[in-house]
């Protein structure tokens, strides 16, 4: 008789999850000399220990503490790039501008990027069939708690001028319910962060509107100002040219507005 299994509303654990995490860890530590001392088997054991045999709706930050410890990494606090709903361009940017970091450029972010995982209460099995959906099932699921934990601490680490890339093609350019809007904005430390600079990325070639005047951007400005942090905003009209100019800043066409 097959054992009854909880059916969740979200997709199950990513195929070959253990192998993927381990392989990513090995790759990351090979690329980043300062992380070469990291024992990837221990990292996987700590990751696994955060959710295996635990009810996938009852995960806490505390469950991830052993993983946080093993993933300790110094991020230059004035080189942090946050993003919301525009991950690919943010990552393309930091691949070119190597001294800036998104969360996914850190070991912990790199390990978990685009992956889903969950276990089952009282069994050592990984659930590859389904995992809790944040809205339909529960918010304290393994994936959501992980990202909330690392996102909060990443924002807390930031100082001086913090940049955030926002998607100008979306109806809500700044979304209070995104990780950026619900976690990172509220955990920037006013005594360390002088300015939050938003880069609003335009989608259409012919889009010449000033999206910095969008009501949701004004809402972001209001939230940030109330936290005694300055706010500035820039339109990036041509993201392709923007990336090109990051690669080749001497290019004569890069003096004009991007």
């Amino acid at each position: 008789v097959p054992r009854w299994r909880q059916q969740w509303s979200g997709p199950g654990t990513t195929k070959r999850f253990p192998e993927t995490v381990l392989a990513r860890c090995v790759k990351y530590t090979e690329i980043h000399p300062e992380m070469r001392h990291v024992d990837c088997q221990s990292v996987w054991d700590a990751f696994k220990g955060a959710f295996i045999s635990k009810h996938p709706c009852n995960i806490t930050e505390e469950d991830y503490q052993p993983l946080m410890k093993l993933g300790t990494q110094t991020v230059p606090c004035n080189k942090i790039l946050l993003w919301s709903r525009i991950k690919d361009l943010a990552h393309q940017f930091t691949q070119v501008q190597r001294d800036m970091f998104t969360l996914e450029d850190t070991l912990l972010g790199y390990l978990a990027d685009d992956l889903t995982w969950c276990g089952e209460f009282n069994t050592s099995k990984i659930n590859y069939q389904s995992c809790p959906d944040w809205r339909k099932d529960c918010s304290n699921n393994p994936v959501s708690v992980f990202w909330k934990t690392v996102s909060r601490r990443f924002a807390e680490a930031a100082c001086d001028v913090v940049h955030v890339m926002l998607n100008g093609s979306r109806s809500k350019i700044f979304d209070k319910n995104s990780t950026f809007g619900s976690v990172e904005v509220h955990n920037l430390q006013p005594e360390k962060v002088q300015t939050l600079e938003a880069w609003v990325i335009h989608g259409g070639r012919e889009d010449s509107r000033d999206l910095c005047q969008d009501p949701t951007i004004k809402e972001l400005e209001s939230i940030i100002s109330k936290r005694n942090i300055q706010f500035s905003c820039k339109n990036i009209y041509r993201p392709d040219k923007f990336l090109q100019c990051v690669k080749n800043p001497e290019d004569s066409s890069c003096t004009s507005e991007i």
């Epitope: 946080m68 909060r152 601490r153």
Partner: antibody, heavy 120, light 107 residues
């Protein structure tokens, strides 16, 4: 603003006990590992102990192992150091310091220190 | 335990001088090194983290370099407020260990 304030120092006889406190304010206490560092009069800095953000993992310098116990109460935003079997060589200013995990391997905020004198 | 050795133990310098303090680790610690400044009767203050990153609010005359076992703290133009004791600290492994300190005095 962000602050760490130590208290509980004083004069104690050899073999005696003392409990130091470090009250944190102005930041999310549970995001930080907390450390005790001491400095004997006219000497350099000596790391004493640390505790992780949940309080489940601790570590001690060999010089205090078995005698000192670090703990924290996250509901009170307070760090503690219970010092037993005190010796003359434990005389020092004791500082608490915070370390953001996992994105900061450094102590960016320190308390003002509290002096512990072990003498008969 | 990883031993941290600073040199010199003390130095005398004048305002405007370029000052260099070195720190050597007993084993490879990659870039897991911090520098702190301490003035008499005060708590230490973080200057440099991760060997070369300037802490927010610290003047740009301070800089750090090095990797592996040998590290340097440089003050490009010494100011009156820079007379203090400087400590390096490794956080590659527990226990965290500090150098013995370098006292920068007025010549």
């Amino acid at each position: 603003q962000v602050q760490l304030v130590e208290s509980g120092g004083g004069l104690v006889q050899p073999g005696g006990s003392l409990r130091l406190s470090c009250a944190a304010s102005g930041f999310t206490f549970t995001s930080y590992y907390m450390h005790w560092v001491r400095q004997a009069p006219g000497k350099g800095l000596e790391w004493v102990s640390y505790i992780d953000s949940s309080g489940s993992s601790t570590y001690y310098a060999d010089s205090v192992k078995g005698r000192f116990t670090i703990s924290r109460d996250n509901s009170k935003n307070t760090l503690y150091l219970q010092m037993n079997s005190l010796r003359a060589e434990d005389t020092a200013v004791y500082y608490c310091a915070r370390q953001l995990m996992p994105f900061g391997g450094y102590f960016d905020v320190w308390g003002q220190g509290t002096l512990v004198t072990v003498s008969s | 335990d990883i031993q941290m050795t600073q040199s010199p133990s003390s130095l005398s310098a004048s305002v405007g001088d370029r000052v260099t303090i070195t720190c050597r680790a007993s084993q490879n610690i990659s870039q897991w090194l911090n520098w702190y400044q301490q003035k008499p009767g005060k708590a230490p203050k973080l200057l440099i983290y991760g060997a070369s990153n300037l802490q927010s609010g610290v003047p740009s005359r301070f800089s750090g370099s090095g990797s592996g076992t040998d590290f340097t703290l440089t003050i490009s133009s010494l100011q009156p407020e820079d007379f203090a004791t400087y400590y390096c600290q490794q956080y590659y492994d527990l226990p965290n260990t500090f150098g013995q300190g370098t006292k920068v005095e007025i010549k």
